[in-house]
């Protein structure tokens, strides 16, 4: 399938001009290669009319140009002084020959319709309203006023000043006069449909002295806006329907032959195909709203329409906006697993891609919630503290320049199952959706910490050990201290020479962490984990409480937190990478609504880095060792 995209059908009238935009994939080669516009002949040959190399055919001389916009990955063909001879099939494309990558465009140029000389033309979009102005002479002021629509032989009444209204216009036609002007009456017709298009006659008075005026009403379907998006990226449909529908329910639907199937509306309807990857956000009181879809698939390509109606469904005669979405399969967004599986008590490491050109952008992880219009509250971010209910079990590891950041969630419960989004305050296309599935654990965890009831005594030495199976022997083991700014890896050293994995003793594989001497600041969550290079694997968590040497001193003993840490882990390693660079912290930015909100998070960011030292001062040593 060609990755070039443009308008399928373009229509205009004689003497007018057209502007045709064609899209191409974002690559250096594409930006610099030849762009062309050619006309298809009966033989299948496509004759070049204009190209970016400077070629211009005789029939386009002085009336056409082709402009490349490499920053937008588009090129535009402008053609003026159209004639009916320009009607035909064309291609816009890329390549040294006209057999390169291309998109078919049909151009239709119609004759200017012949209308009576005094005809006033009104051009309106479907669903909008029109106010027709009907002037008359003063002597016809007391007389009946009317508007009729011309049919083949007669003129069918629409409305008159005696409250007579054609049934098909009841509730949407009004006749009125304004101010003190006794020489004009007006007819307003709302909720326009294609059927309303045609010739009308305004009349004041009867017989030969009547005042008449011809009116031509053109009702147009809105021109679809073209959207060119990469596979796995995201798209935002910005819908602005006007104040008159501000209080109506809003919807987005996708054209399917004759019908338009609702994907989402503000009344709570949502197509299951878009579960976990769609949000509808009312913008203001003027009827503006947006729909965001992430994780674009091939089958998402098509014709979309937004609208407003109390039913939340498409309704004839109500305003609409349309788009043609093209999903480019030559995507720059890497193909990652969209489903990650974990088990209760276990952990998952999720790799989130971002635009490598924007390594300094702020990274976030949010949980998609489908209630209402759908929303995605941020759970953690490079400058957003971890949400309280995720204390001790969620961290984001940034890997600047690598194009991936990692989110680790441990102590999993079945309630963690659901959809999560990776997003940044930079390139909004790089939003990805992950579905997390959590099954009940059926075996012992891969990582186990002893002692399980971890209470350290102030000033003494305290050691905890993390047992791991032989399959993790060759992987790097680490301990880190969790804070709501991240999990800071503690310095480690190997205990004893490494044995070959063949003689791996299942019972003696452990990595220990020693606190010496224990201080009050040591209280908190610690993680034991494994990683291979920059790819994070499993983790387990333990809460270490610190108490005074004297017995009977009270401390909170988070038994269920520790109990949770020892439930089974499933061997589910998701490709990911990590940085030991500390995370920055600002107050949580709150629920994620749209790009602007995330952008604001970045704008507010304070450069107050957490301390970069993993070891601590005052002669205390914090270390982890592996056997």
């Amino acid at each position: 399938k060609s990755p070039i995209f443009g308008p399928q059908e373009v229509s205009s009238i004689e003497g007018d001009s057209v502007s045709i935009t064609c899209y191409y994939p974002d690559t250096s080669v594409n930006r610099h290669t030849r762009k062309y516009w050619c006309r298809q002949g009966a033989s299948g040959m496509c004759t070049t009319l204009i190209s970016s190399n400077g070629y211009l055919s005789k029939e386009y001389s002085g009336r056409a140009n082709l402009i490349n916009f490499p920053e937008n990955n588009t090129f535009v063909i402008n053609i003026e002084q159209l004639t009916q001879d320009d009607t035909g099939s064309y291609k816009c494309g890329l390549g040294t020959s006209n057999r390169g990558l291309s998109f078919d465009v049909s151009l239709e140029v119609s004759q200017v319709p012949e209308l009576p000389s005094d005809t006033h033309v009104y051009t309106k979009d479907i669903g909008r309203n029109v106010t027709i102005e009907c002037p008359f002479k003063r002597e016809n002021a007391p007389s009946k006023k009317s508007l009729c629509k011309k049919t083949n032989q007669s003129c069918e009444l629409v409305i008159d000043s005696t409250e007579k209204v054609n049934p098909s216009y009841i509730g949407r036609a009004k006749l009125f006069m304004k101010g003190t002007d006794l020489t004009v009456f007006y007819v307003n017709i709302s909720h326009l449909t294609h059927n309303d298009a045609g010739l009308y006659i305004c009349q004041a008075g009867e017989g030969p002295s009547a005042d008449k005026k011809n009116v031509d009403l053109q009702v147009l379907a809105p021109e679809p806006e073209l959207l060119y998006k990469d596979l796995r990226s995201s798209v935002t449909f910005e819908c602005d329907l006007g104040r008159e529908v501000a209080n109506e329910a809003k919807y987005l639907c996708r054209m399917n032959k004759e019908t338009c199937d609702v994907i989402i509306n503000t009344l709570g309807k949502r197509d299951p195909d878009f579960e976990g990857r769609i949000l509808i956000t009312p913008k203001d009181d003027n009827g503006r709203f947006s729909v965001l879809i992430t994780g674009l698939r091939k089958e998402d390509a098509g014709h979309y329409q937004c609208g407003a109606h109390s039913s939340g469904l498409p309704q004839e005669g109500w305003p609409i906006q349309t788009w043609q979405l093209f999903v480019n399969e030559e995507s720059t967004i890497p193909n990652r697993r969209s489903v990650v599986k974990g088990v209760t008590g276990g952990s998952v490491a999720i790799a989130c891609p971002y635009n490598p050109k924007e390594s300094s952008s702020l990274k976030y992880w949010c949980r998609w919630e489908g209630d209402g219009n759908g929303h995605c509250p941020v759970l953690v971010g490079t400058q957003a503290q971890v949400q309280e209910e995720y204390e001790g079990r969620l961290a984001l590891f940034d890997q600047p320049g690598n194009g991936t950041y990692t989110v680790i969630l441990n102590q999993l419960t079945t309630e963690d199952a659901g959809f999560y989004w990776c997003l940044t305050n930079g390139d909004s296309r790089w939003r990805t959706t992950i579905e997390l599935q959590v099954a009940e654990a059926t075996r012992e965890p891969n990582l186990e910490v002893t002692p399980q009831n971890a209470t350290a005594v102030l000033g003494e030495t305290f050691t905890v050990s993390c047992h791991y199976p032989c399959k993790f022997y060759s992987q790097e083991k680490y301990w880190c201290k969790w804070s709501n700014k991240g999990c800071h890896i503690l310095p480690s050293h190997d205990e004893g020479a490494r044995q070959s994995s063949v003689s791996c003793d299942q019972s003696s594989q452990l990595v220990s962490m020693t606190l010496n001497p224990v201080s009050k600041e040591d209280e908190g969550w610690y993680w034991c984990g494994v990683k291979q290079g920059q790819t994070y694997g499993e983790t387990t968590a333990i809460y270490i409480a610190v108490e005074e040497r004297t017995r009977g001193s009270s401390h909170v003993n988070p038994t269920d937190a520790n109990a949770r840490a020892k439930v089974a882990l499933e061997e589910e390693v998701v490709d990911s990478s990590i940085s030991e660079k500390e995370n920055k912290a600002i107050p949580n930015p709150g629920p994620f609504a749209n790009e602007r909100e995330i952008q604001n998070v970045g704008d507010q960011a304070q450069e107050n880095r957490a301390s970069g030292d993993a070891g601590s001062a005052d002669g205390q040593s914090r270390s982890s060792s592996s056997k």
């Epitope: 006023k145 000043s161 216009y169 009841i170 009004k174 009125f176 006069m177 101010g179």
Partner: nanobody
């Protein structure tokens, strides 16, 4: 703006007659239709009759057809409601209403944008 003032209400015996009058002032050229509505205690406001200003046409509620007549006097800017064969159920406060557009729906009170203060009609049996 359009101002409306009703007059002619009062007490009348069943079978008798009354003539209500509605005087319009202000920007009366914009008035397209004038209607009479009534409201009895504890009941909804209901349509009685209407007349169009540009091209005379009259409309009546079924309950008053043949007994009430609506008419206008353009020179005086008045609209009258002649009520004959009055019945006890005709007793109510009668309101004159005007609207500055036509839409084919003349019998809904919320489609009228100007209202008078009302005049009381009492019918004794």
């Amino acid at each position: 703006q359009v101002q409306l003032v009703e007059s002619g209400g009062g007490l009348q015996q069943a079978g008798g007659s009354l003539r209500l009058s509605c005087a319009a002032s202000g920007r009366t050229v914009t008035v397209m239709t004038v209607g009479w509505f009534r409201q009895a205690p504890g009941k909804e406001r209901e349509f009685v009759a209407a007349i169009t200003m540009y091209g005379e046409r009259t409309y009546y509620a079924d309950s008053v057809k043949g007994r009430f007549t609506i008419s206008r006097d353009n020179a005086k800017n008045t609209v009258d409601l002649q009520m004959n064969s009055l019945k006890p159920e005709d007793a109510a406060v009668y309101y004159c209403a005007a609207r500055t557009y036509v839409s084919g729906i003349y019998d809904r009170f919320d489609d009228y944008n100007y209202w008078g203060q009302g005049t009381q009609v009492t019918v004794s049996s």
